[in-house]
Amino acid sequence: CKAMHVAQPAVVLASSRGIASFVCEYASPGKATEVRVTVLRQADSQVTEVCAATYMMGNELTFLDDSICTGTSSGNQVNLTIQGLRAMDTGLYICKVELMYPPPYYLGIGNGTQIYVIDPEPCPDSDF
């Protein structure tokens, strides 16, 4: 039974280029050396994994090459950036943190960040 406290902002507005950034912060009960961070998207009763990364404390956060996420870590704080977002991707993005090693295993789920994405208006044709 190990539900850590995980904090994340309630609302974030993506940039016109479809990029959204937010901080996911967790209160570690122990001295974890290996941490796994997962971003989940919840729509109604469906939960899908957006991206995930495992990192060693003090090292950089590494997502897979084809991931839409990038991030950096500092202590018990992870700065997450999701790119390539479109209006249809507007929704609740949940930060899940797992302390993988050493035991004991701890898990925490944030309340979610509502990311709003507005597709940019197409540029009007120029008459030249």
Epitope: K2, A3, P29, G30, L40, I94, P103, P104, Y105, L107
Partner: antibody, heavy 115, light 108 residues
Framework: EVKLDETGGGLVQPGRPLKLSCVAS????????MNWVRQSPEKGLEWVAQ??????????YYSDSVKGRFTISRDDSKSSVYLQMNNLRVEDMGIYYC??????WGQGTSVTVSS | DIQMTQSPASLSASVGETVTITCGAS??????LNWYQQKQGKSPQLLIY???NLADGMSSRFSGSGSGRQYSLKISSLHPDDAATYYC??????????FGGGTKLEIK
Amino acid sequence: EVKLDETGGGLVQPGRPLKLSCVASGFTFSDNWMNWVRQSPEKGLEWVAQIRNKPYNYETYYSDSVKGRFTISRDDSKSSVYLQMNNLRVEDMGIYYCTGGMDYWGQGTSVTVSS
Amino acid sequence: DIQMTQSPASLSASVGETVTITCGASEIIYGALNWYQQKQGKSPQLLIYGATNLADGMSSRFSGSGSGRQYSLKISSLHPDDAATYYCQKILSPPPWTFGGGTKLEIK
């Protein structure tokens, strides 16, 4: 080697108190949230109580069935966790396990409530 | 409170077979689920944590999967030693951290 040794179980009359103790070794006790879980043939495994550690201000949580009657406590200097059970009922009978996180389990101590 | 429904309550299978045990939560639990193995007369042992991660010292024939509200434990190439009762448990706050009712596995 990880060890959790529960003691204090036994036969007790309904309405009477009983205190269980658990001594841990082989892991960093202060990093663990400690729990008591009980098991009976009627109810299977049932989580009873949890006490978190210093970074979480030793917060305590209880199942509804024991709230107000049971108290969980810990002594990090002795790597020990306790369960004070008051006003025991017949339905509290079972094997009580002490767990470190949920990763480590003791061998259990049996509690029988009968007049 | 979130309820955990485990099925089947019991099953019997032969050595070498593959079996699957399922656990359903009454609400989304985001993979916050553990599986335990309890052999006759012994304490439960952590088998799978966080829905998919195999606990130290456990055979790789055990695997966990699932998301949202539905989770499963798969045991491949059954051994006689796998005879036990298996429990799932929700480890998501708030409490209680409820267990499923258990699945008793008998090896023929």
